[in-house]
């Protein structure tokens, strides 16, 4: 030290702005000044540290100056920092320099960083656009430090935006989102890598949501405890200040508790709970939760009502009688209720608790929800409201009518794949059993056939657009005997049975019964196809043919039920039935009700025997139907007389019969001869069936002679003859 003229300010023994020393050495630092002074040390150096000592003495010319010596034994790396000597306040004039400082680096190759955050990074708060310091200060000014952002970004000092200061760390002039993350300062000393980590944490003012529960309006009875919870959701880096405005704020009526919930890793939830015990009428009004975060400001209001005593008022929301429709997904029976506190709610259906009656009933608030409405849901519904503590009870009844769209029972029972056929001329009873609420009106209609005269088909009955409403005296289509309607209880419900009686089935078409009420309309179509063919399909054989004769088969089908009519021959080969088509079939002929297809096979032989089938396709089902007939062509057989003629006598004026029964295939033709002359039928001579008998009445003597019968067919001829003797000839007559 020089003891020259007056000092400009405190003077340190170590000159310059910084000084480097090795760890383990002792730091000696003297301060001389014109006034009393004190030492300011790095935060890492404790004033109570046994290694630290400060000795004060008078010094300088005439001991008029103040000196103090700071001694730090066995200096450590973390003792690195700013050491300053400062005049005590009011101890010197304002013109003087008040403080002198020096930055001491305590260099330690094993501790390049003053603070090591290797296990858990140190949190550093940052604000975008402001200066950010990553405080990885070093123990020696010549240590090279790099700054990395995890995982692999390097933040390189450019002397402007990012600068390195061995005393302060990395200084980022105006921080951006790019600096948010895990930042690591790295230094390699003597081949060893040292790292200290910092987690930059951006402070934001993002208020995501503000809510008050319970939701507004909030109702209380006098004397109850009012509790309101204001919940604020912010992003992870936001902190908020919460306050309440409320009617009793001036008298501090409420106690307010605050807490923070950080269980969500990506947001913060702040709670402010306002509580007033024994709420009074003066506490009613607007309660406002005010939330502030930096420049962000949000408020949320709720309205509080305080009632002296409980109350219930109940009215019909709609009319007392409500209507709904069966099949509806749900129906809500709802009453207009004003009540406090919330009453107990019970709904009755016809005097029985509704929810016990059916699982389809559920109570929501003051409403009864009926799911999947059915006719059984009709009835009287009563809402019972009760507040037991206030001994308050109210009830109100509403009537529910369940309307049902008309249903025709016969439509629901499985219908036949193809319509029935009605025999020509028959009396028919057509019935529709109808249910609906309100009771449906039933009408019968007649739809005449509309023929589609296309090449493909000219005999099918299409439903026509035109229709005629029928009554008991209608003669359109078919003569109507009558239309009747009667009520019947079927399966526990009132149903209307409507009957249409057709007196004489002649005209094909379709009848329909139409049932309608205010809910809707339903129609059942009854195709009325008249047939002149038993069962709508008939096969006949004219006669059993004999070899050489013609085979004649006939197939008649209902034209309303069948199409594609054809004859086929069935043959069995190796236990398999083969269908053989028959060529040279005639064209089918169409009549009023049927289609006829005749099959004629001329000059049949035994080989033509077999199973003949008429095949037709059902118009409705597409199914092929076969009707079979066995044809056995008979073999030719030569005639055979079953009994020969025998001579016999007959009295004159008597009568006689000659019998010539013959068998053969084909049936033989019988011819009679008398004395070789062919007998023709004439008065007195009668030929019986098939000429097999010869009857002579009032025999005369001319009738005597040789009678011969001849049986003939393609296979041969057979004859028999006999002599007829007439007794009492001219002798008798002469006697007369």
């Amino acid at each position: 030290y020089c003891s020259g003229s007056k000092l400009k300010g405190p003077e340190l023994s170590l000159k310059g702005t910084q000084h480097v020393m090795q760890a383990g050495q002792t730091l000696f630092l003297k301060c001389r000044g014109e006034a009393a002074h004190s030492w300011s040390l790095p935060t890492t150096v404790s004033q109570e540290d046994k290694k630290l000592s400060v000795t004060r003495s008078a010094c300088g010319r005439n001991n008029r100056q103040f000196c103090s010596t700071l001694t730090l034994n066995m200096a450590q790396a973390n003792h690195t920092g700013l050491y300053s000597c400062r005049y005590l306040p009011k101890s010197t004039s304002k013109e003087k320099k008040m403080e002198s400082a020096i930055y001491i680096f305590v260099s330690d190759a094993g501790s390049p960083f003053i603070e090591m955050h290797s296990d858990i990074p140190k949190l550093v708060h940052m604000t975008e656009g402001r200066e950010l310091i990553i405080p990885c200060r070093v123990t020696s000014p010549n240590i090279t430090v790099t700054l990395k952002k995890f995982p692999f970004d390097a933040l390189t000092p450019d002397g402007q935006r990012i600068a390195w200061d061995s005393r302060r760390g990395f200084i980022i002039a105006n921080a951006t989102y790019k600096e948010i993350g895990l930042l690591t300062c790295e230094a390699t000393v003597n081949g060893h890598l040292y790292q200290t980590s910092y987690l930059t944490h951006r402070q934001t003012n993002t208020i995501l949501d503000v809510q008050i529960s319970p939701p507004s309006p909030v109702r209380f009875l006098r004397g109850q405890t009012l509790v309101l919870n204001c919940t604020v959701t912010t992003d992870l880096n936001t902190r908020v200040q919460m306050s309440w405005n409320y009617p009793g704020k001036a008298t501090k009526r409420a106690s307010i508790r605050q807490r923070i919930d950080q269980s969500n890793p990506h947001s913060n939830v702040f709670h402010s709970v306002l509580k007033i015990n024994n709420v009074e009428s003066r506490d009613k009004g607007l309660y406002t939760c005010r939330v502030k975060s930096g420049s962000s400001f949000r408020t949320f209001n709720t309205s509080v009502h305080v009632y002296e005593k409980g109350f219930i008022s109940v009215k019909h929301r709609k009319q007392q009688v409500q209507e709904t429709i069966a099949g509806k997904r749900s129906h809500r029976l709802s009453m207009k209720v004003k009540a406090f506190p919330s009453p107990e709610v019970v709904w009755l259906k016809d005097g029985v608790p509704a929810t016990e009656k059916s699982a389809r009933y559920s109570v929501h608030g003051y409403s009864l929800i009926i799911k999947d409405v059915t006719a059984e849901d009709a009835g009287d519904y009563t809402i019972l409201l009760g507040i037991k503590q206030s001994k308050l009870f109210r009830n109100l009844t509403a009537t529910l009518i369940v309307n049902v769209k008309p249903q025709i029972y016969e439509k629901s029972v499985s219908s036949l794949p193809s319509p029935p056929l009605y025999p020509l001329g028959s009396r028919q009873v057509l019935t529709c059993t109808v249910y609906g609420i309100p009771q449906p009106t039933i009408k019968w209609l007649w739809h005449p056939c509309h023929y589609n005269h296309s090449k493909e088909r000219n005999d099918f009955c299409f439903g026509s657009e035109e229709s005629f409403i029928l009554d008991s005296s209608s003669n359109i289509g078919n003569r109507i005997e009558g239309i009747t309607q009667r009520m019947m209880v079927i399966e526990g419900t009132n149903k209307t049975v409507s009957t249409l009686v057709v007196a004489d089935s002649r005209t094909p078409g379709s009848y329909s019964c139409k049932a309608f009420n205010k809910i809707g309309t339903v129609e059942r179509d009854i195709r009325f196809y008249v047939t002149d063919v038993p069962n709508g399909f008939h096969v006949s054989l004219e006669k059993i043919p004999t070899e050489g004769e013609d085979l004649k088969l006939s197939c008649v089908v209902s034209k309303f039920l069948y199409r594609d009519i054809t004859w086929i021959l069935l043959r069995t080969v190796n236990n398999r039935t083969m269908h053989h088509s028959i060529s040279k079939q005639k064209m089918a002929t169409t009549q009023d009700y049927s289609i006829t297809l005749n099959l004629v096979i001329k000059n049949v032989s035994l080989e033509d025997s077999g199973t003949y089938a008429c095949r037709a396709r059902n118009i409705y089902t597409g199914e092929e139907i076969l009707r079979k007939t066995e044809v056995l062509v008979r073999d030719l057989e030569a005639p055979l007389l079953l009994q020969n003629l025998s001579d016999h006598e007959v009295s004159i004026s008597g009568s006689t019969t000659l019998d010539c029964q013959a068998r053969g295939v084909p049936a033989p033709q019988i011819t009679w001869f008398k004395n070789n002359h062919k007998i023709q039928q004439e008065p007195g001579i009668i030929l019986g069936p098939g000429n097999s008998t010869l009857f002579i009445e009032r025999v005369t003597e001319e009738d005597e002679g040789v009678y011969r019968c001849r049986a003939t067919n393609q296979k041969g001829v057979v004859e028999s003859s006999a002599y007829l003797t007439v007794q009492g000839t001219s002798d008798k007559s002469n006697l007369e």
């Epitope: 995982p151 993350g181 987690l199 890793p265």
Partner: antibody, heavy 119, light 111 residues
Amino acid sequence: EVQLLESGGGLVQPGGSLRLSCEASGFDFSTYAMNWVRQAPGKGLEWVATINSEGTITSHAPAVKGRFTISRDNSKNTAYVQMNSLRAEDSAVYYCSSTTGTTHGMDVWGRGTTVTVSS
Amino acid sequence: QSVLTQPPSASGTPGQRVTISCSGSSSNIQNNYVYWYQQLPGTAPKLLIYFNSQRPSGVPDRFSGSKSGTSASLAISGLQSEDEADYYCGTWDDSLNGWVFGGGTKLTVLG
């Protein structure tokens, strides 16, 4: 709610290509690095690729280097991995993960999308 | 072959303490933070431990992590049946310039 949703997986023939997408919601996507990690059936987790917050630096696992490319579009809050020259051994569930929040580990994961490479 | 080494399986009865080890090298565990992940059957992994020993909010304090040199370990005390899962350790690897994982340890809760 913080969410990652992967898409683009499917069946592809060896030598074919696929592009997987990972859409982020509920956090500041542009601030954090994104990763793709895969898991073959019955096997452990295998890191595939990482991209920094700005999309300027990428790193790929040796097994996929030269065939796979990680990228991101911060305007769409979406990360991608383009997979070319696919092999049978690339068949796996591919997860997208991000290093959000304060942990800087993979603290948000998607549900995964399945990639099957088979002829 | 995983860069980090974990035992393939571990087991314990309810209430017991179980430790899972994870061993690496200077380029990964020694110079970087260790993370532990839990993967329940059929789900995506979930972060269990970060910065060697820190628990994210929502993770029970039965789970704890530690690191020493090139090794790390996960301890689960008061084992519960819902802890049955696969556990993976993970860290950044400076030489690979990427994440590395252990092969996973299947934890079975007996009884």
